[in-house]
């Protein structure tokens, strides 16, 4: 089984990556429905991973234009990718007191694909401090 | 050590059909999506069709669509190519390849055909 | 959709020179999106560089990847004899391949 640091950085890795597809997807934003999505924004501390899966379950879809219809669906699959049950244990501890899903403003694809990236660019700063100041939970 | 190994090509005529194979070992098949690439003598690499890891989506070239059809059986460690009014064009070897993405959180993440079999010539002629 | 295009076609250099080959999206392609094979002849490809700029496993650092947007760039340091091949972009996700550049010996 992988050792604690090296599933730390794939970790780490895992997030960079979904940040690239939220750029790549932020390229095809004219080929995307454009339907209001629920975009949590200033999250909580500890609510991180409560609106990491509020962002996975929106319903991000392709406009079926044509042309990128491939990339855009390979992109919005990939950014529902699951984290391990550790993390969806941290997200557990701290589901009862965070904001439902459609309590989050809604917001255009452009803007919710900013909201997700900025959540992401957090919980990674995060995630690179706790290792830091050798804190277990991230 | 990690392999991929096609079969099934061969000389067929045109409008008829003609089922790859593609047998993987030395990795966790079922957690990988899989590609097949083709490459007609003497010219480049065409995409052909993908499918993800558990079947659950597949992607086609447009100069396949309807015709060929791509599937895989994780419990033999194998992926299909069911090519199907087979013309002139469609005469290449045909790769399949690895997706370098595992679906595991913590497994590989590149993004790009990370593992090749040796290929399979299919040759349509009448 | 995406169109790549390699340029040169056919790059004509000797051991020891150092290679430059290029690749142009048709519109603009997130970095973590960009791959380089090569191909010798006979050969299935082999992926050189994913994510623009990271070597895949058992590449030697003479090779490298950089670019971003549109623009992306396959540096050979030193040709070596056995890099004398084909060498093909792509775009994941689309998975769409460039036409190639031929690096051959001069």
């Known amino acids: 089984h992988k050792s604690s640091s090296q599933g730390q950085d794939r970790h780490m890795i895992r997030m960079r990556q979904l940040i690239d597809i939220v750029d790549q997807l932020k390229n095809y934003v004219n080929d995307l429905v454009p339907e209001f999505l629920p975009a949590p924004e200033d999250v909580e501390t500890n609510c991180e991973w409560s609106a990491f899966s509020c962002f996975q379950k929106a319903q991000l879809k392709s406009a079926n234009t044509g042309n990128n219809e491939r990339i855009i669906n390979v992109s919005i699959k990939k950014l529902k990718r699951k984290p391990p049950s550790t993390n969806a244990g941290r997200r557990q501890k701290h589901r009862l007191t965070c904001p439902s899903c459609d309590s989050y403003e809604k917001k255009p694809p452009k803007e919710f694909l900013e909201r997700f990236k900025s959540l992401l660019q957090k919980m990674i700063h995060q995630h690179l401090s706790s290792r830091t100041h050798g804190s277990e939970d991230s | 050590q990690v392999q991929l190994v096609e079969s099934g090509g061969g000389v067929v005529q045109p409008g008829r059909s003609l089922r790859l194979s593609c047998a993987a070992s030395g990795f966790t098949f079922s957690s990988y999506g899989m590609h097949w690439v083709r490459q007609a003598p003497g010219k480049g690499l065409e995409w052909v069709a993908f499918i993800w890891y558990d079947g659950s989506d597949k992607y086609y070239a447009d100069s396949v669509k309807g015709r060929f059809t791509i599937s895989r059986d994780n419990s033999k460690n194998t992926l299909y190519l069911q090519m199907n009014s087979l013309r002139a064009e469609d005469t290449a070897v045909y790769y399949c390849?690895?997706?370098?993405?595992?679906?595991?959180?913590?497994?590989?993440?590149?993004?790009?055909?990370?593992?090749w079999g040796q290929g399979t010539t299919v040759t349509v002629s009448s | 959709e995406i169109v790549l295009t390699q340029s040169p076609g056919t790059l004509s250099l000797s051991p020891g020179e150092r290679a430059t080959l290029s690749c142009r999206a048709s519109?603009?392609?997130?970095?973590?999106?960009l791959a380089w094979y090569q191909q010798k002849p006979g050969q299935a490809p082999r992926l050189l560089i994913y994510g623009a700029s990271s070597r895949a496993t058992g590449i030697p650092d003479r090779f490298s990847g950089s670019g971003s947007g549109t623009d992306f760039t396959l540096t050979i340091s030193r040709l070596e004899p056995e890099d004398f091949a084909v060498y093909y972009c792509?775009?994941?996700?689309?998975?769409?391949f460039g036409q190639g550049t031929k690096v051959e010996i001069k």
């Open positions: 519109q603009s392609v997130s970095s973590s999106y």
């Open positions: 390849a690895r997706d370098g993405d595992s679906s595991d959180w913590y497994g590989d993440y590149y993004f790009g055909m990370d593992v």
């Open positions: 792509q775009q994941y996700g689309s998975w769409t």
